[in-house]
């Protein structure tokens, strides 16, 4: 699968993670920091 | 199976305001983005401006700025856009468009007559 | 607001040509460009996104390649079916559309 790193139009998608362009999907994907869960990282979970 | 199901075509007087609404089903709008699109008759496609329905934030085009706003309302998963002060050259299709977790899926259209 | 200059504005070629459209943006949009082909009444389909990447069902005859600030959208044969306008979208910092390139037959 080809990623890259998020357009800048994407800054602040991801609430608590990084953003990853998956290319060949034609989406965005939010990679969360450890506690956080949803699409876009919006939800603690510990 | 994803939709964005736009509202039905309006006629606005000059000078009136109009309201175009756009209903997420098979997703949740708080997942993405929604970007608008218009497109007057015979004329390409321009962007006006996008909401992040989660934050609440809002990004317009700089030629509709304080003529547009774009709202959305996560409980019914619906996104608007109210452009006012309408006048002749407002004439066009408006498209809601969806991105973030997918690239670019398109509403049906709403076409907006502005005549007097 | 990021420009983006679309060119040639309309161009007519025979069946089986090679077609080229360029979009030119006011400064670099690290690739991510999409270009749409739309036919009268109907709503635009995406082609390709991220500068070359082809979308699900859409024919290997459309390409596109480019960075910096040059983008370039081919038909490498072009089809009766072909015969729409072509719209390249930068998306890197919101959003605009070149002005379209109206695609027909000679």
């Known amino acids: 699968v080809s990623i890259t790193k998020c357009n800048s139009d994407m800054n602040g998608y991801c609430l608590h993670g990084q953003c990853i362009y998956l290319v060949d999907m034609s989406q965005n994907y939010c990679r969360c920091e450890v506690g956080y869960t949803g699409v876009r990282c919006e939800h603690f979970y510990l | 199976q994803d939709q964005l199901v736009q509202s039905g075509a309006e006629v606005k007087k000059p000078g009136a305001s109009v309201k175009v609404s756009c209903k997420a089903s098979g997703f949740n709008i708080k997942d993405t983005y929604i970007q608008w699109v218009r497109q007057a008759p015979g004329q390409g496609l321009e962007w006006m401006g996008r909401i992040d329905p989660l934050r609440g934030n809002t990004k317009y085009r700089e030629k509709f700025e304080g003529r547009v706003t774009i709202t959305a309302d996560t409980s019914t998963n619906t996104a608007y856009m109210e452009l006012s002060s309408l006048r002749s050259e407002d004439t066009a299709v408006y498209y809601c468009v969806r991105s973030g977790t997918l690239f670019d899926f398109w509403g049906q259209g709403t076409l907006v007559t502005v005549s007097s | 607001d990021i420009q983006m200059t679309q060119s040639p504005s309309s161009l007519s070629a025979s069946v089986g040509d090679r077609v080229t459209i360029t979009c030119k943006a006011s400064?670099?949009?690290?690739?991510?460009i999409a270009w749409y082909q739309q036919k009268p009444g109907q709503a635009p389909r995406l082609l390709i996104q991220y500068t070359s990447t082809l979308q699900p069902g859409v024919p290997s005859r459309f390409s596109g390649s480019g960075s910096g600030t040059d983008y370039t959208f081919t038909i490498s044969s072009l089809q009766p079916e072909d015969i729409a306008t072509y719209y390249c979208?930068?998306?890197?910092?919101?959003?605009?559309f070149g002005g379209g390139t109206k695609v027909e037959i000679k």
């Open positions: 400064q670099d949009i690290h690739k991510y």
């Open positions: 979208l930068q998306y890197d910092r919101l959003r605009t």
